[in-house]
C-alpha cells in the first residue's frame, strides 16, 4: 500500500522556539515515522532538518537549527515505513515574519501603595529579536484580586511603577510585549499576584515640580509633616528601556541630600541635556518613607518653558487677557515649538480666594468681575504632552482695577 504524504503542516515560532505540527494522512497505518528537509532561498539542494528526522509523533522542534531569521525558507515532509510517501511541500516563509513574541518574564516588588514591575524578554539573548531588543514595549492588565475589574496600561518599558494602590491588597497582573515597528503583539505572561504591604508610617512626598530660576533648577514638593529631612535622586529615563538589566543606578543630587526644607536648589549644569527621572524620599531620623512618584524631567523643555507674558484690558465686569511669548534676557521673545495650555489664577486683591481658568487660546476672558475692584492675575504655561507633564513657574502677579459699571463693550 502506498503511504500518503502528511498534510496540514503548521509552523509555530515563538521567540527562538521553532515547532512543526502536522496531521497523519492515514491513521490506520501504524509505526510510521516522519522526516523533514529544508531549503534556503537561492539553493537547489534540500538539507535534512535536524531534530525532525524519523519522528514517531506529529510534532517536532527544530530550534537547534541556526537559521538566518530574515531569510526565506522552504520545508517538505514525507512519511516513512518500509517505503516512503511523496514529499509534501510547505509554503515558504521567513522566520522573523512568522515569529510571535513569547510571554515576558515578570518580577514584582511591593510597597504599601505601589507596585514596581520589572519586565524582561522571555528568551534571554534571543536570536529572533536580537536587532529589536531595545524596541520592545509592553502593556499590562492589572486587577484587584477581590474585584476582578481590569485596568489596562499601554506602552510601558522594562520597569514600570503603578501608584495610588490600596495597602494590604492583593493585585494580579499579566504582561505582554509588542514590537510596534514590526506590527507584532506578543503572548501574555502567566498571571502574577502580589500583596501590597501594610501602610507605611511616613507617606512619600507629593506634587514634585521643577522650575528654573536664574541658572538654577528649583525642585519643590509637598509633605504632610514638619521636621523631616529629604533626599532627591535622579536616573536617566532611557535606562528604564534597557531589557534584562534591572539594576537601576539612581544618583543623589548633592545639593538635595538631607535637606530640611520641601525644596532644593541646584545648578543647571548638574544635568546635561536629556530626559531624567526624579524622586524624593522623606525621613524623620528613625523611619523613612517610600520614594515619591517619579517625575519626568526634560532639560530642554524645562530650560525653555518660561512663564507667559500677558497684557490685561480691563472692563467693568471682566478682564481680557492677551498672552504673548515669554521674553528672554535682551527682550527677545522665546519661540515655543510645542503646544501649551495656560493656567490663569486670579483673585480679588483684598481676598485670598483664588479662581482658576485653564485655556489653550492665547486670548482669554476672565468673566464675572465686580466693577471698580482691584484683581490680581498670574499665569503659567503647561506642556500638553501627558508624558512630559511640564509646567513653567507662575509669572509675577499683575494687579488691575476694573472699570466703573456699564463699560462692558
Amino acid at each position: 500500500k502506498n503511504l500518503k504524504s502528511p498534510q496540514k503542516v503548521e509552523v509555530d515560532i515563538i521567540d527562538d522556539n521553532f515547532i512543526l505540527r502536522w496531521n497523519r494522512s492515514d491513521e490506520s497505518v501504524g509505526n510510521v515515522t516522519f522526516s523533514f528537509d529544508y531549503q534556503k532561498t537561492g539553493m537547489d539542494n534540500w538539507i535534512k532538518l535536524s531534530g525532525c528526522q524519523n519522528i514517531t509523533s506529529t510534532k517536532c522542534n527544530f530550534s537547534s537549527l541556526k537559521l538566518n531569521v530574515y531569510e526565506e525558507i522552504k520545508l517538505r515532509i514525507r512519511a516513512e515505513k518500509e517505503n516512503t510517501s511523496s514529499w509534501y511541500e510547505v509554503d515558504s516563509f521567513t522566520p522573523f515574519r512568522k515569529a510571535q513574541i513569547g510571554p515576558p518574564e515578570v518580577h514584582l516588588e511591593a510597597e504599601d501603595k505601589a507596585i514596581v514591575i520589572h519586565i524582561s524578554p522571555g528568551t534571554k539573548d534571543s536570536v529572533m529579536w536580537a536587532l529589536d531588543g531595545l524596541s520592545f514595549t509592553y502593556s499590562l492588565v492589572i486587577w484587584k484580586n477581590s474585584s476582578g475589574v481590569e485596568e489596562r496600561i499601554e506602552n510601558i518599558y522594562s520597569r514600570h511603577k503603578i501608584y495610588k494602590l490600596s495597602p494590604e491588597t492583593t493585585y494580579c497582573l499579566k504582561v505582554k510585549a509588542a514590537l510596534l515597528t514590526s506590527w507584532k503583539i506578543g503572548v501574555y505572561s502567566p498571571v502574577h499576584c502580589i500583596k501590597t504591604t501594610v501602610e507605611n508610617e511616613l507617606p512619600p512626598p507629593e506634587n514634585i515640580e521643577v522650575s528654573v530660576q536664574n541658572q538654577n533648577y528649583v525642585l519643590k514638593w509637598d509633605y504632610t509633616y514638619a521636621n523631616m529631612t529629604f533626599q532627591v535622586q535622579w536616573l536617566h529615563a532611557f535606562l528604564k528601556r534597557n531589557p534584562g538589566n534591572h539594576l537601576y543606578k539612581w544618583k543623589q543630587i548633592p545639593d538635595c541630600e538631607n535637606v530640611k526644607t520641601t525644596q532644593c536648589v541646584f545648578p543647571q549644569n548638574v544635568f546635561q541635556k536629556g530626559i531624567y527621572l526624579l524622586r524624593v524620599q522623606a525621613s524623620d531620623g528613625n523611619n523613612t518613607s517610600f520614594w515619591s512618584e517619579e517625575i519626568k524631567f526634560d532639560t530642554e523643555i524645562q530650560a525653555f518653558l518660561l512663564p507667559p507674558v500677558f497684557n490685561i484690558r480691563s472692563l467693568s465686569d471682566s478682564f481680557h487677557i492677551y498672552i504673548g511669548a515669554p521674553k528672554q534676557s535682551g527682550n527677545t521673545p522665546v519661540i515655543q515649538d510645542y503646544p501649551l495650555i495656560y493656567e490663569i489664577i486670579f483673585w480679588e486683591n483684598t481676598s485670598n480666594a483664588e479662581r482658576k481658568i485653564i485655556e489653550k487660546k492665547t486670548d482669554v476672558t476672565v468673566p464675572n468681575l465686580k466693577p471698580l475692584t482691584v484683581y490680581c492675575v498670574k499665569a503659567r504655561a503647561h506642556t500638553m504632552d501627558e508624558k512630559l507633564n511640564k509646567s513653567s513657574v507662575f509669572s509675577d502677579a499683575v494687579c488691575e482695577k476694573t472699570k466703573p459699571g456699564n463699560t462692558s463693550k
Partner: antibody, heavy 118, light 107 residues
Framework: AVQLQQSGAELVKPGASVKLSCTAS????????MHWVKQRTEQGLEWIGR????????KYAPKFQGKATITADTSSNTAYLQLSSLTSEDTAVYYC???????????WGQGTSVTVSS | DIVMTQSQKFMSTSVGDRVSVTCKAS??????VAWYQQKPGQSPKALIY???YRYSGVPDRFTGSGSGTDFTLTISNVQSEDLAEYFC?????????FGGGTKVEIK
C-alpha cells in the same frame, strides 16, 4: 562564569593601612555595584559600603565612614577596599560581592582574612 | 536606621523536616529582602532576592515569603547539606542591613 577573586591574607600592625583587591571575571564591573562586607570570627555580616565603578560614586555605612575607602579600576575590572588606622577590631574576613539586579548581592568572593597584631 | 532582627540564633531540625527562619525589619521595607546561606568555612551564597524570588540553581525546597516588616525563609525537606547559617538582608539602592544570622543544625 562569574567569579570574584580576592587577594591573599594580610597580617598588619596596629595603626597601619591595608588595601584589599577583588578582581572580577565573567562580567564587566561597570555594569554593577561592587560591595564590601566584614565578618568577624563567629559573628554576623556587616555591610561596609559599595561603589558604582562606572562613575566612582561610593556609599558607606556610617560606622565605616573614615575607616574604609572603596575604589575601582575598570581597566583591570578590579574593586579595592582600603582600611586605615587599623586596630584589633578590624581583624576579620572581608568579602567583596557583586550588586546585581534588584540590588541584591548575587555573587561573592572567597574572602580575605585581615589580622591586626603587633 | 533600619534594623533587621533574626530572633532565633539557633534552630535544630532533622533531615526531611521543614524549618522556617524568620526575620523582622524595624520598619516597612516593602519586598526588598534577600536571604543568604553561609556554610562553615565558606563565603555566603545568595538564595533569595526581593523576598520571594529564588536565584537560578537554588533548590526549590528553599522558599522566601513576606513583605513589609516580617519575612520568612522556609526550607522544606531539609537535607544534611543545608547545615549552615542563614542571613536576611534589606536591599535597595542605598542601604544594605544584614540580620544577625540563624544557624540551622541537623539533629
Amino acid at each position: 562564569a562569574v567569579q570574584l577573586q580576592q587577594s591573599g591574607a594580610e597580617l598588619v600592625k596596629p595603626g597601619a593601612s591595608v588595601k584589599l583587591s577583588c578582581t572580577a571575571s565573567g562580567f564587566n564591573i561597570k555594569d554593577y555595584y561592587m560591595h564590601w562586607v566584614k565578618q568577624r570570627t563567629e559573628q554576623g555580616l556587616e555591610w561596609i559600603g559599595r561603589i558604582d565603578p562606572e562613575d566612582g560614586e561610593t556609599k558607606y555605612a556610617p560606622k565605616f565612614q573614615g575607616k574604609a575607602t572603596i575604589t575601582a579600576d575598570t581597566s583591570s575590572n578590579t574593586a579595592y577596599l582600603q582600611l586605615s588606622s587599623l586596630t584589633s577590631e578590624d581583624t576579620a574576613v572581608y568579602y567583596c560581592a557583586r550588586g546585581g539586579n534588584y540590588y541584591a548581592m548575587d555573587y561573592w568572593g572567597q574572602g580575605t582574612s585581615v589580622t591586626v597584631s603587633s | 536606621d533600619i534594623v533587621m532582627t533574626q530572633s532565633q540564633k539557633f534552630m535544630s531540625t532533622s533531615v526531611g523536616d521543614r524549618v522556617s527562619v524568620t526575620c523582622k525589619a524595624s520598619q516597612n521595607v516593602g519586598t526588598n529582602v534577600a536571604w543568604y546561606q553561609q556554610k562553615p568555612g565558606q563565603s555566603p551564597k545568595a538564595l533569595i532576592y526581593s523576598a520571594s524570588y529564588r536565584y537560578s540553581g537554588v533548590p526549590d525546597r528553599f522558599t522566601g515569603s513576606g513583605s513589609g516588616t516580617d519575612f520568612t525563609l522556609t526550607i522544606s525537606n531539609v537535607q544534611s547539606e543545608d547545615l549552615a547559617e542563614y542571613f536576611c538582608q534589606q536591599h535597595n539602592s542605598y542601604t544594605y542591613k544584614f540580620g544577625g544570622g540563624t544557624k540551622v543544625e541537623i539533629k
